[in-house]
Amino acid sequence: MNGRVDYLVTEEEINLTRGPSGLGFNIVGGTDQQYVSNDSGIYVSRIKENGAAALDGRLQEGDKILSVNGQDLKNLLHQDAVDLFRNAGYAVSLRVQHRLQVQNGPIGHRGEGDPSG
């Protein structure tokens, strides 16, 4: 019997300083490139090794970026979102949504190997 999969959603403000090679991540999404069904939001698809985001350590693959320097990323074309990041300046403030998967087992059941606390 499989457990239910739930998600813990949290938001965080991440301030990055643009490094010599930029911010150091890739994005997917946009109104013309829906990465998640019925969601035209912008998501992080790659964190570049030794880039600004990787060195900061808080931004993760799969995070949804809600805003850049206070500018909402809703209803943007993919390339417009890319351009927004590229023109965001030296100090970049990202409002991000982390979505952590939480596996819940059936109520009243502890599977083999589960820590007993």
Partner: nanobody, 125 residues
Framework: HVQLVESGGGLVQAGGSLRLSCTAS????????MAWFRQAPGKEREFVAA??????YYADSVKGRFTISRDNAKNTMYLQMNSLKPEDTAVYIC?????????????????????WGQGTQVTVS
């Protein structure tokens, strides 16, 4: 993890044509930034062409002769190679990364890509 498989290589006479294919796994193929590189024996890996969400890029040595394209419904990228020359002889390798960089894109930089195929041999006699 993304798997890339190239096909379409072979032996062709100078002036001839070939079409290479690179088929990728994954349900979000349309979001991939993709490229072709080539490597001749004893030489460095060399950028050939790339295709992003917003456009295409070519090495000067192939401009006007090669065309990169993709079919998102088939999870496949193509390289149409015309007017082939003996110096085009190499193993042609497909590369990909998910999404678009938010930084300045350098299509010829191998570090832009996370996934690589095994390659397909092209020999021009």
């Amino acid at each position: 993890h993304v798997q890339l498989v190239e096909s379409g290589g072979g032996l062709v006479q100078a002036g001839g044509s070939l079409r290479l294919s690179c088929t990728a796994s994954g349900r979000t193929f349309s979001t991939y930034t993709m490229a072709w590189f080539r490597q001749a024996p004893g030489k460095e890996r060399e950028f050939v062409a790339a295709i992003t969400w917003s456009g295409t890029y070519y090495a000067d040595s192939v401009k006007g002769r090669f065309t990169i394209s993709r079919d998102n419904a088939k999870n496949t990228m193509y390289l149409q190679m015309n007017s082939l020359k003996p110096e085009d002889t190499a193993v042609y390798i497909c590369a990909a990364v998910i999404g678009s960089t938010v930084d300045s894109y350098t299509p010829s930089d191998p570090l832009e890509y996370d996934y690589w195929g095994q390659g397909t041999q092209v020999t021009v006699s």
